[in-house]
Interface confidence: low
């Protein structure tokens, strides 16, 4: 399907005469009839097999013909055809004089013909105009012509149908030869297959529209190249989906048991040495000059509270110095110039005279101490809590807050390692002096009975179409990772594709 276009450009009839030689009165009001037909070696009358077209009156005698194509006019003249362009043609152009407004053949005088030209030849489909000029004794006609394809038709003969589309059935435009040219982001014979995000993993990812990357089960990440570990896996990794391979220092089925508290938490301060002493427990060996469970306290000579009777201690490079309160003197403020008459006992302490009143002693109520009952008793100074327990003052008493794995008033008792049921899959737990041991049921092994040795859901090869099978250890089931083009829990169904391209 296409259009033969004829562009009339200039007609010269300087004497204003008809083909018969008779002059037009007052001038030749000229219109044209065009006949397009199949190739004839000698162009002869007969049906215009490719079509006909007539113009209105375009001018008088000699004139240029305006290009009206942009305004919806009739120049170029259009001769559409609905067949494969044969590449050859015959063309007859007649110039007629119209004395009145009726241009029908039967309304014209028999000698109204001004001129007639007939050409024939080859013409390929294309955008370029072929210019021609035909001259007779009295007239000259300048014109150009071409054949172009109708919308959606392409190729050398306008025989190839191609309609651009951007929907489920294809995403393309048409090339000049009618071949498809995929829109950006699409590929395939009919441009139905999206081009996924650059780098999207071929097996583990797919896409339904361009520049996306959708992950198959068990995979994640921008490019679907990161496997998803087993559900609940805390400190582990995987190389295929649903695995849980523990990082160094972690153990258990879900890699959630801390076997290296020292490395993971660095609890010891001030350059102390840390030693792991079981799950979540540790011991800090302090450097000289430091103390505390985590060696967080700096030792000084004043730490032993050498100053008596409320004296304040000041550290010095070569020791310490006691600043004594009024009424006391001596290296440690141990000598008193006070007597009971001066009420030296604080916090409800009772004063007792000594050495005939030259000295005195205070009897302190509970929770207070010191020569003058000036100090509140700190029952935690002796670090009574074992195994890294935290000592808390509670009025007249104290209590220990134990670390996990320990109990008792002073955290001196080890909680049974079996209390947390560490053995998986019904394994039997045995407490040992240095930890625990699991006795596993048939079909399981490993330190915690976490390894399945006989039951394997993938052993029966349940996945079809070369899909990859993964065993889910927590549910004794399998997961099939389907290759491209298959779906279903066992990848047994091919993805439905349109049987042929729908025009």
């Amino acid at each position: 399907s296409g259009v033969f276009q004829l562009q009339l450009q200039e007609f010269i009839n300087e004497r204003g005469v008809l083909a018969s030689g008779r002059p037009c009165e007052p001038g030749c009001r000229t219109f044209f009839r065009v006949c397009l037909k199949h190739f004839q070696a000698v162009v002869s009358p007969g049906p215009c097999t490719f079509g006909t077209v007539s113009t209105p009156v375009l001018g008088t005698n000699s004139f240029a013909v305006r290009d009206d194509s942009s305004g919806g006019g009739r120049n170029p003249l259009q001769l559409p055809f609905n067949f494969t362009w044969p590449g050859t043609f015959s063309l007859i152009i007649e110039a007629w004089h119209a004395p009145g407004d009726d241009l029908r053949p039967e309304a014209l005088p028999p000698d109204a013909l001004i001129s007639k030209i007939a050409i024939q030849g080859s013409l390929a489909v294309g955008q370029n105009w072929l210019l021609d000029e035909q001259t007779s004794t009295l007239t000259r006609l300048r014109y150009s012509y071409r054949v172009i394809c109708s919308d959606n038709y392409y190729g050398d003969n306008c025989s190839r149908l191609c309609k651009k589309r951007n929907d489920h059935f294809g995403h393309y435009v048409c090339q000049p030869d009618g071949n498809l040219s995929c829109l950006p982001g699409w590929t395939g014979e009919y441009c139905q297959q999206p081009i996924c995000l650059s780098g999207c993993h071929e097996q583990n990812g797919y896409c339904s529209k361009p520049a996306e990357c959708l992950c198959r089960p068990g995979w994640q990440g921008r490019l679907c190249n990161e496997c998803i570990p087993h559900n609940g896996c805390r400190h582990g990794t995987c190389s295929t989906p649903w695995q849980c391979t523990c990082d160094e220092g972690w153990g258990g089925l879900f890699c959630d048991q801390d076997l290296n508290y020292c490395t993971h938490h660095s609890p010891c301060k001030n350059g102390a040495t840390c030693s792991n002493s079981g799950q979540r427990s540790y011991t800090c060996t302090c450097r000289p000059g430091y103390t505390g469970v985590d060696c967080e306290l700096e030792l000084s000579e004043c730490d032993s509270n050498p100053c008596r009777n409320g004296g304040s201690c000041k550290d010095q490079e070569d020791g310490y110095h006691c600043l004594c309160p009024p009424g006391y003197y001596g290296l440690h403020c141990e000598h008193s110039t006070l007597s009971c008459a001066d009420s030296p006992c604080f916090n409800g302490g009772s004063c007792r005279e000594r050495n005939q009143g030259a000295n005195y002693a205070c009897e302190c109520p509970p929770n207070f101490t010191g020569s003058n009952c000036e100090k509140k008793v700190d029952r935690c100074t002796s670090n009574p809590c074992a195994n890294g327990g935290q000592c808390l003052n509670r009025g007249p008493s104290r209590m220990c807050r134990c670390r996990p794995g320990f109990t008792g008033t002073y955290c001196e008792l080890h909680v049974s390692d079996c209390a947390r049921n560490p053995c998986a899959h019904g394994g039997t737990c045995h407490d040992l002096e240095n930890g625990l041991m699991c006795t596993c049921p048939a079909g399981f092994s490993g330190r915690r009975c976490e390894v399945r040795t006989s039951i394997d859901a993938c052993a029966s090869s349940p996945c079809f179409n070369r899909a990859t099978c993964y065993t889910d250890l927590s549910t004794d089931t399998f997961v099939c990772n389907c290759p491209y083009g298959f779906v279903g829990s066992r990848c047994e169904f091919p993805v439905g594709l349109p049987p042929s391209f729908p025009w």
Partner: nanobody
């Protein structure tokens, strides 16, 4: 929308030169013959020069022959008129237009017109 925009006019002394330009848009310029038309003060329009669509054929009014040169650049959609040895009688508003009817001496009917550019030749 078809547009023809003339430029290059101005005041020039007798014997001087000017080059007029006509920028076309909104239609296939290379398919059209083009012409220059002028309207002297108090007179009707008169044809000056014309050129065919390809630029191979040029036509001039007797009054400007040998002094004016018409040309075109289809790639730039522009028509030109080089005017040398200007005379006071060349004073007019100059228009570019698409001829649609020709007489024995040149175009006499036009399709599209520009708005014109004033040329004044005076000492």
């Amino acid at each position: 929308e078809v547009q023809l925009v003339e430029s290059g006019g101005g005041l020039v002394q007798p014997g001087g030169s000017l080059r007029l330009s006509c920028a076309a848009s909104g239609f296939t310029f290379g398919n059209y013959d083009m012409s220059w038309v002028r309207r002297p003060p108090g007179k009707g329009p008169e044809w000056v020069s014309a050129i065919n669509s390809g630029g191979g054929s040029t036509y001039y009014a007797d009054s400007v022959k040998g002094r004016f040169t018409i040309s075109r650049d289809n790639a730039k959609n522009t028509l030109y008129l080089q005017m040398n040895s200007l005379k006071p009688e060349d004073t007019a508003v100059y228009y570019c237009a698409t001829p649609r009817g020709w007489g024995p001496t040149g175009p006499h009917e036009y399709g599209y017109w520009g708005q014109g550019t004033q040329v004044t030749v005076s000492s």
